[in-house]
């Protein structure tokens, strides 16, 4: 059995070129004729060269997955979908993505140091020693309030809580 | 004699409309794949359409698709290529060529002696 | 599209040399290659098709070789009706039918 170039395919023991992107293939090659192609129909497409005889189906882009359509289909390009805002995409194969999920929130302590994309998740950071944060979509850490001196500091502020200074 | 003769050219203004014949004798028309191939003054050859005998597979180039129009009529051993919507890009001597191997994936073994097209204001 | 790219632009050669065209397809065409010959004034004359096929009529100091992406036409012995441009045309993948852009056979 013969081993076909790059660009073309088997039939029976017979190498034939393929279609360019954007076509199937109609009718393979013979003796003296090449391979003959169709365009392919609505919503259905070929992103490569290739040897099928029918055209792939484009994608849909899931509302409920957390997706929106931010490319149409083209006959040599598959949907390309996008994660609606405050979500980002989980399952990227290549520039289709089949899942979202919500973006990170920062948990008390933590600043954001990214905000979330399309397709990356926030990036939170630990707030320093001196300053403390709530979380949520903070970007910079507050620092602890200096007790006055008129009051008593109550308790020492943390990562996630401010100084307790006395009411006197 | 087997041959092909175009006739249909002349000087057309933008945005005009031209319809070109191509007569076969000598050999079965109705049995052939048909095609109009062009050639730019002074460039090189470029493929334009297609028809296969029965009338029901036809092709087009990117250049010229929804502008032109092939067709033939078997009983009077005829080709036909209607362009509309003329563009001065269109200018070219126009040829009229027999396939072999009644495919669009095939060569062209006859040819016309074309005919051709001027579009200027 | 299978873009097809034709070398050299001109060949300049004398009556009885050998002449050698190149042509090159931008992706795998298989055999399905062919060539013509074009004078001035005239309508292109089918040479060869599946990349070594003589067409029927022509002379045989003309050949051609080669498979894939690169394709050889040869005329062993130029004869003076031999000056011309010559085309290649793939029809290994249609639509659509691409030629090259033409070798000029020129007398030296």
């Known amino acids: 059995q013969p081993s076909c170039r790059q660009e073309e395919f088997l039939v029976g023991d017979e190498c034939c070129p393929m279609c360019n992107p954007g076509y199937h293939v109609k009718q393979v090659c013979s003796e003296h004729t090449g391979t003959v192609c169709a365009p392919c129909p609505p919503q259905t497409y070929t992103a490569h060269a290739n040897g099928l005889s029918k055209c792939l189906p484009c994608g849909v882009c899931d509302p409920d997955m957390g997706l929106l359509t931010w490319q149409e289909c083209s006959s040599w390009k598959d949907t390309v979908c996008r994660c609606i805002p405050g979500y980002f995409c989980e399952n990227q194969d290549g520039s289709h993505c089949s899942t979202c999920l919500q973006h990170t929130t920062c948990p008390p302590g933590q600043r954001v140091e990214k905000r979330g994309t399309h397709d990356q998740d926030t990036v939170c950071a630990d707030c320093l020693t001196g300053t403390f944060s709530l979380g949520g979509t903070q970007e910079e850490c507050l620092p602890w309030t200096n007790c006055s001196a008129f009051q008593q500091e109550v308790r020492r502020g943390t990562n996630s809580t401010d100084t307790t200074c006395s009411s006197q | 004699e087997v041959q092909l003769l175009e006739s249909g050219g002349g000087l057309v203004q933008p945005g005009g409309s031209l319809r070109l014949s191509c007569a076969a004798s000598?050999?079965?028309?109705?049995?052939?794949?048909m095609s109009w191939v062009r050639q730019a003054p002074g460039k090189g050859l470029e493929w334009v359409s297609l028809?296969?005998?029965?009338?029901?597979?036809?092709y087009y180039a990117d250049s010229v698709k929804g502008r032109f129009t092939i067709s033939h009529d078997n009983s009077k051993n005829t080709l036909y290529l209607q362009m509309n919507s003329l563009r001065a890009e269109d200018t070219a001597v126009y040829y009229c060529?027999?396939?072999?191997?009644?495919?669009?994936?095939?060569?062209?073994?006859?040819w016309g002696q074309g005919t051709l097209v001027t579009v200027s204001s | 599209e299978i873009v097809l790219t034709q070398s050299p632009g001109t060949l300049s050669l004398s009556p009885g040399e050998r002449a050698t065209l190149s042509c090159r397809a931008s992706?795998?065409?298989?055999?399905?290659l062919a060539w013509y010959q074009q004078k001035p004034g005239q309508a292109p004359r089918l040479l060869i098709y599946?990349?070594?096929t003589l067409s029927s009529g022509i002379p045989d100091r003309f050949s051609g070789s080669g498979s894939g992406t690169d394709f050889t036409l040869t005329i062993s012995r130029l004869e003076p009706e031999d000056f011309a441009v010559y085309y290649c045309q793939q029809y290994g993948s249609s639509p659509p039918i691409t030629f090259g852009q033409g070798t000029k056979v020129e007398i030296k």
């Open positions: 060529a027999r396939g072999r191997g009644n495919t669009i994936s095939g060569t062209f073994d006859l």
């Open positions: 992706r795998s065409v298989g055999k399905y």
């Open positions: 028809i296969s005998y029965s009338g029901s597979n036809k």
């Open positions: 599946s990349a070594s």
């Open positions: 000598g050999f079965t028309f109705s049995t052939n794949y």
